[in-house]
Amino acid sequence: REAAPKSYAIRDSRQMVWVLSGNSLIAAPLSRSIKPVTLHLIACRDTEFSDKEKGNMVYLGIKGKDLCLFCAEIQGKPTLQLKEKNIMDLYVEKKAQKPFLFFHNKEGSTSVFQSVSYPGWFIATSTTSGQPIFLTKERGITNNTNFYLDSVE
């Protein structure tokens, strides 16, 4: 049986959701006028970079779009970007596609996503609405790195 990605809506503790703005992801308040993205999540089959203490290795994509999250260095700083890629194309690759990989770890009822390419760097939202989703190594008050994955039918 062919694997299929799981679908989730994603929120942070301040009820900010992820929204597609052009070809980038931003955080916006959960509201009726805003259409949040549905996140596609699928496990990586290759175990080359696996580290169970950090979580399960997953690819993250945007449902309904051939867009996947990946990490690259820009001016010496790890940066979160969206790349035109079908998540299933990543999944079927025998070799793990490291820039697209994240460690998915559960902390209580929340999920945390850490870059495999840049250990210690986590997907985060700012406390300010309308700001891009980004990578941070500073977990805490000013950045939200814990997310709720809400099942969507």
């Epitope: 929120r11 301040r14 009820q15 959960l30 509201s31 009726r32 006028s33 406390t127 709720y148 809400d150």
Partner: antibody, heavy 122, light 111 residues
Framework: ELQLQESGPGLVKPSETLSLTCTVS??????????WGWIRQPPGKGLEWIGS???????AYNPSLKSRVTISVDTSKNQFSLKLSSVTAADTAVYYC??????????????WGQGTLVTVSS | ESVLTQPPSVSGAPGQRVTISCTGS?????????VHWYQQLPGTAPKLLIY???NRPSGVPDRFSGSKSGTSASLAITGLQAEDEADYYC???????????FGGGTKLTVL
């Protein structure tokens, strides 16, 4: 049709703990994307949000009451509960439980219990 | 005292139009969180009247409408009827408090 019913003592002594339960019927307390809240209304005054718990078990509390409040869920009984410690006369109010869904009511409350009056007095 | 500010009272004659304002700040209404309105008839529990700024749940007459702009929102009631006499509350979410916030309530009197 979803219905909520508050229950608990109508009289609590000062310094004691107020305990209320909200029984959910016509739906599951673990229903995907649902959140459940406690809201109170002192006699002749406005509504005050006390705290909430959602289907993941995540809780949030009003900062002004946080040190005294605990909200929990009993999935086996399809209930959620409120505990408010060290009560004073200022905690005398009608207490309501309420329901919402993240991607349907957008942080509003669409179903309310009928409310229960709790008086704090010795 | 309330995070959202409403006038304590408004009044109007039957058939008239009245509006109730709700003023918040940049951490709630101004941050683009939705505003919801509740009607509380005497001696009863609040009932959701408007959700998501301007949407009526089924069963709510179209005489009731909501709008939002900047850090404020308003509820309009047209063709005022005696049974509209009630308390009305606005509600939103505040990210700085990580919680739900209510207005102080407005008592509507039908003259």
């Amino acid at each position: 049709e979803l219905q909520l019913q508050e229950s608990g003592p109508g009289l609590v002594k000062p310094s004691e703990t107020l305990s209320l339960t909200c029984t959910v019927s016509g739906g599951s307390i673990t229903s995907s994307n649902a959140y459940w809240g406690w809201i109170r209304q002192p006699p002749g005054k406005g509504l005050e949000w006390i705290g909430s718990i959602d289907y993941t078990g995540s809780t949030a509390y009003n900062p002004s009451l946080k040190s005294r409040v605990t909200i929990s869920v009993d999935t086996s009984k399809n209930q959620f509960s409120l505990k408010l410690s060290s009560v004073t006369a200022a905690d005398t109010a009608v207490y309501y439980c309420a329901h919402g869904k993240y991607y349907e009511t957008y942080l509003g409350f669409d179903v309310w219990g009928q409310g229960t009056l709790v008086t704090v007095s010795s | 005292e309330s995070v959202l500010t409403q006038p304590p009272s408004v009044s109007g004659a039957p058939g008239q139009r009245v509006t109730i304002s709700c003023t918040g700040s940049s951490s709630n209404i101004g941050a683009h969180y939705d505003v919801h309105w509740y009607q509380q008839l005497p001696g009863t529990a609040p009932k959701l009247l408007i959700y998501g700024n301007d949407n009526r749940p089924s069963g709510v007459p179209d005489r009731f409408s909501g709008s939002k702009s900047g850090t404020s929102a308003s509820l309009a009631i047209t063709g005022l009827q005696a049974e509209d006499e009630a308390d009305y509350y606005c509600q939103s979410y505040d990210y700085s408090l990580s919680g739900y916030v209510f207005g102080g309530g407005t008592k509507l009197t039908v003259l």
